[in-house]
């Protein structure tokens, strides 16, 4: 422990200028004080001043008030330092002396005489509050105050608790009156050495080395480190754990860079035509009447739909057409006839039936012919019956659909699994993806279909971590790590809570 007993002498009155022995001072009592502080004694006895002692210079003659903080050892209040735990009790002896000698060091002068003395015994707690007292005898009066305070960096009831404020690597704190630590703003912990991170900084995914900071751990980003970083190269996807790439709607592939909804994203079909998606970046435009081309971008001739019947010839006009009817026919589309069955109007073996009491007729056409006079051969492809970009072909009385790769069925309406044809050689595993099959090859093979035998085995160096299975073969010298539950990453090096949906390609 360490502290200071402080004594403030306030006023001394010796109006008659008398010594303790009854003699008077000549010309007056030039007064200094001796103070002795010791352990508590029920009866004060001579002997060493165990807690310390101090003397003052001459402070005045006979009666005087002490207001200055005098220089040297005469500082007011007088200081009695101690280097032990304050016991809470004490004995104090204050003696007033007259000196005929030196003002500053009267203690050393011969012929000093006692004027009076007082003895105080009791208890005193450590604190800043002064205890004020006054002692009288027949000749003199002394008023004074005293207290015990702790030395710098010492605290507590007995000045035994050491605490030194600091603001460095080992702590950031001030000291409370009882010596306990009070952390500076932004710091916490037993020794106030733990920074308080930015409010909201994720407990697991972020950390800090100074207050109001938030440094992200690998795989996390954002001001509060609460946003995961998706797999490198992930284009149209998100993550819920680091290094994931969960595709947005309409996108596919390992990096979500394959457009599965080309129609919505790009609107390639023009002039009100209908767009149908057909695999990554694949689509088909179904045109409205009067339009043609891959994107229905070409406007057909107004006559293209053969609107003129009964052999009428069609002439294009601005925004319209005009039918030139053959003899015996009239009307906008040459649909009205002046002929009767007697004129044999039905072609291609069509049967003529009279109507309206013989004033008109109707032809009943044999199979594969149509038109009011059975003059047209039936085209079974006009209705665009083939789906998914299939080509329609007339085959005599019927028609067939020629399907694009990957589709089958009468109208090419069925999607064939690419893996159904077992495209992977040498025991490779086939994955049916939107843009075609992907093969993961066994060790020693590579290529799109595991058709290439490789001398260098990319898996030989054991590049996969955490018990993952290594495959080669997506392309020469490449390998794939198939991660066990709880790990992701190109080498299965990152622990997570969920299994990857597909092995990562290194």
């Amino acid at each position: 422990g360490s502290g200071i007993f402080q004594l403030r002498l306030q006023e001394f009155v010796n109006q008659r200028g008398m010594l303790a022995n009854g003699q008077s001072c000549e010309p007056g009592c030039r007064t200094f004080f001796r103070i002795c502080l010791k352990h508590f004694q029920a009866t004060f006895s001579e002997g060493p001043c165990t807690f310390g002692n101090v003397s003052t210079p001459v402070l005045g003659t006979n009666s005087f008030v002490v207001r200055d903080k005098n220089s040297g050892s005469g500082r007011n209040p007088l200081q009695l330092p101690f280097n032990f735990t304050w016991p809470g009790t004490f004995s104090l002896n204050i003696q007033a002396w007259h000196t005929p000698g030196d003002d500053l060091r009267p203690e050393t002068s011969p012929g000093n005489s006692l004027i009076s003395q007082i003895i105080i015994q009791g208890s005193l707690a450590v604190g800043k509050i002064w205890r004020t007292d006054e002692q009288n005898d027949t000749l003199t009066r002394l008023s004074y105050s005293y207290r015990v305070i702790c030395s710098d960096n010492y605290y507590g009831e007995s000045c035994s608790r050491l605490c030194k404020k600091r603001d460095d690597h080992f702590g950031h704190y001030e000291c409370q009156p009882d010596g306990s630590l009070s952390c500076l703003p932004g710091w916490t912990g037993k020794y106030c050495d733990q920074p308080i991170c930015l409010s909201g900084c994720h407990e697991q995914n972020g950390y800090c080395s100074k207050p109001d900071e938030c440094i992200c751990r690998p795989g996390w980003q954002g001001r509060l480190c609460n946003e995961c970083i998706p797999h490198n190269g992930c284009r149209h996807g998100t993550c819920s754990i680091p290094w994931q790439c969960a595709c947005d709607e309409g996108w596919g592939g390992l990096f979500c860079d394959q457009d599965l909804n080309y129609c919505t994203h790009h609107s390639p079909c023009k002039n009100g035509s209908t767009c149908s998606n057909s695999g990554p970046k694949g689509y088909t435009c179904t045109c409205l009447p009067g339009y043609t081309g891959e994107h229905c971008e070409l406007g057909l001739s107004k006559c293209a739909s053969n609107p003129c019947r009964n052999g009428g010839s069609c002439k294009d006009q601005e925004n319209s057409y005009h039918c030139l009817c053959p003899p015996g026919y009239y009307g906008q589309h040459c649909e009205h006839s002046t002929l009767t069955c007697a004129d044999s109007p039905c072609f291609n073996g069509g049967s003529c039936r009279e109507r309206n009491q013989g004033s008109s007729y109707a032809c009943e056409c044999p199979p594969n012919f149509t038109g009011s006079n059975c003059e047209k051969k039936v085209d079974r492809c006009t209705s665009n019956p083939c789906a998914n970009g299939g080509q329609c072909q007339n085959r005599g009385p019927s028609r067939t659909c020629r399907c694009r790769p990957g589709f089958t069925g009468t109208h090419c309406e069925l999607h064939i699994s690419d893996c159904a044809r077992s495209p992977c050689a040498h025991g490779g595993t086939c994955h049916d993806l939107e843009n075609g099959p992907v093969c993961t090859c066994p060790a020693g093979f590579s290529g799109r279909r595991c058709e290439v035998r490789i001398t260098h085995d990319a898996c030989a160096s054991g590049p996969c971590f955490n018990g993952a299975t290594c495959y080669t073969g997506l392309s020469p010298n490449n390998f794939v790590c198939n991660c066990p539950y709880g790990f992701v990453g190109s080498r299965c090096e990152f622990p997570v809570g969920l299994p990857p949906s597909f092995p990562w390609v290194a």
Epitope: F64, V65, W130, D133, S143
Partner: antibody
Framework: EVQLQESGPGLVKPSETLSLTCTVS??????????WGWIRQPPGKGLEWIGD???????YYNPSLKDRVTISVDTSKNQFSLKLSSVTAADTAVYYC?????????????WGQGTLVTVSS | SYELTQPPSVSVSPGQTASITCSGD??????VSWYQQKPGQSPVLVIY???ERPSGIPERFSGSNSGDTATLTISGTQAMDEADYYC?????????FGSGTKVT
């Protein structure tokens, strides 16, 4: 809380004696921790310490006023008084009574509100 | 007789620091008190024993005393601190006030 209140005439004729009393309430004037003092302030000027007294009777005065000043204490009434003789116009001032706390190094921690005394015929 | 000298005035912007000096022969050997006085009011003790603050006085008031000069410092000065400031010391048994400084 201790309060101090000055009282006395606001007008004094030149050459006469100025007399003021300070009444202490809310605490005892007989405390050994305090001196009871008088300070004055001429209009538009600074503060000037006049003197003080201990409850037991000890008095201390400004050397420049020592010959004209008397300060006394009446512990039974909890009052202390100032007498300034042979006044001139230069003694016109606001007079304050104050409590000087020895524990505060003699700092005056309580003041009266002050009373203006004009010296004029 | 003992004299304490203060500058007549000190100007400071709000939020800045104001320093008022008080000079006297070997003033560092004496205890210095500082008082604030606003127009029409009694003085208020703001610093005692060179650097101690009475209860109720804001922390922005601080004091120091060494050699021949004592200083009152007001850090982060506020509009309400505009006032006259007086230093005071004890010369033997008599009190002495400084001439006063107007802080604006």
């Amino acid at each position: 809380e201790v309060q101090l209140q000055e009282s006395g005439p606001g007008l004094v004729k030149p050459s006469e004696t100025l007399s003021l009393t300070c009444t202490v309430s809310g605490g005892s004037i007989s405390s050994s921790s305090y001196y009871w003092g008088w300070i004055r302030q001429p209009p538009g000027k600074g503060l000037e310490w006049i003197g003080d007294i201990y409850y037991a009777g000890s008095t201390y005065y400004n050397p420049s006023l020592k010959d004209r000043v008397t300060i006394s204490v009446d512990t039974s009434k909890n009052q202390f008084s100032l007498k300034l003789s042979s006044v001139t116009a230069a003694d016109t001032a606001v007079y304050y009574c104050a409590r000087e706390d020895m524990i505060l190094g003699g700092g005056a921690d309580n003041w009266g509100q002050g009373t203006l005394v004009t010296v004029s015929s | 007789s003992y004299e304490l000298t203060q500058p007549p005035s000190v100007s400071v912007s709000p939020g800045q620091t104001a320093s008022i000096t008080c000079s006297g022969d070997r003033l560092g050997d004496k205890y210095v008190s500082w008082y604030q006085q606003k127009p029409g009011q009694s003085p208020v003790l703001v610093i005692y024993e060179d650097s101690e603050r009475p209860s109720g006085i804001p922390e922005r008031f601080s004091g120091s005393n060494s050699g021949d000069t004592a200083t009152l410092t007001i850090s982060g000065t506020q509009a309400m601190d505009e006032a006259d400031y007086y230093c005071q010391a004890w010369d033997s048994e008599a009190g002495v006030f400084g001439s006063g400084t107007k802080v604006t």
